[in-house]
């Protein structure tokens, strides 16, 4: 089976690299822009020059392109606790990001949100905290893994997982009860 | 307004080196690329070499592997490192915002004697 290709790929494959086909003659292989520029005018003819125009401030292209118009630079989102690490320029992209001892939870290909590192209190890191996954922890006895918190065994409720973690307590609670009884 | 000014043109021997510097102000510099051109006698102007902002370059296939781009975002400098130089290298060579931008230095002379 042949992939579907769209038209702008179709027609990107007829010429080498770095050339697209003119929209109106496809016998004219015309230059691609640099990435920071846009296409203003396709080349007059063959072995013409394209003419490419800079990008305004607050608008990029970050690779080599026939765009009509440079993209919008992105804004970094603060009510998701993201922190710009490099300002938009004419040919890449802000570059948004988490504070130190934070870290990248992403609800969809595109958005993430910060959050701070877990401490593994009552614990021990595992796994470092990195850009895109929270510290990995390990607990101590008497303690059971919850939400990626060490939690008193006290906490643990008969029905939950952590039943096999803090058995010993489970049985002490139950055993206390039991002794209560007439 | 935009200023772009060359220097470190002049006379040279074939094979030998030159620096030219271009410095650069009326706006921030981090945020463009930057690029060389040249124009010899009677030729069209053509582009030697470009930098992006973070740092990639590219080069004519005419002096790959002897010229080399660089750009100081502190001192708002971009460079251009010519080595085993050419007679046919000869001309006067151009500092621009980016590849395409209207604005341009005055120009600087090369001239490489055989």
């Known amino acids: 089976l042949v992939p579907h290709l769209g038209d702008r790929e179709k027609r990107d494959s007829v010429c080498p690299q770095g050339k697209y086909i003119h929209p109106q003659n496809n016998s004219i292989c015309c230059t691609k822009c640099h990435k920071g520029t846009y296409l203003y005018n396709d080349c007059p003819g063959p072995g013409q020059d394209t003419d490419c125009r800079e990008c305004e401030s607050g608008s990029f292209t970050a690779s080599e392109n026939h765009l009509r118009h440079c993209l919008s630079c992105s804004k970094c989102r603060k009510e998701m606790g993201q922190v710009e690490i490099s300002s938009c320029t004419v040919d890449r992209d802000t570059v948004c990001g988490c504070r130190k001892n934070q870290y990248r939870h992403y609800w969809s290909e595109n958005l993430f949100q910060c959050f701070n590192c877990s401490l593994c209190l009552n614990g021990t890191v595992h796994l470092s905290c990195q850009e895109k996954q929270n510290t990995v922890c390990t607990c101590h006895a008497g303690f059971f893994l919850r939400e990626n918190e060490c939690v008193s065994c006290s906490n643990c409720k008969k029905s939950l997982e952590c039943t096999k973690l803090c058995l010993p307590q489970i049985e002490n609670v139950k055993g206390t009860e039991d002794s209560g009884t007439t | 307004q935009v200023q772009l000014q060359e220097s470190g043109g002049g006379l040279v021997q074939s094979g030998g080196s030159l620096r030219l510097s271009c410095r650069a102000s009326?706006?921030?510099?981090?945020?463009?690329?930057m690029s060389w051109y040249r124009q010899a006698p009677g030729k069209k102007r053509e582009l030697v070499a470009g930098i992006y902002t973070d740092g990639s370059t590219n080069y004519a296939d005419s002096v790959k592997g002897r010229f080399t781009i660089s750009r100081d975002n502190a001192k708002n400098t971009v460079y251009l490192q010519m080595s085993s130089l050419k007679p046919e290298d000869t001309a006067v060579y151009y500092c621009r915002r980016s590849m395409v931008s209207v604005y341009w230095g005055q120009g600087t002379q090369v001239t490489v004697s055989s």
């Open positions: 009326g706006f921030t510099f981090s945020h463009y690329p």
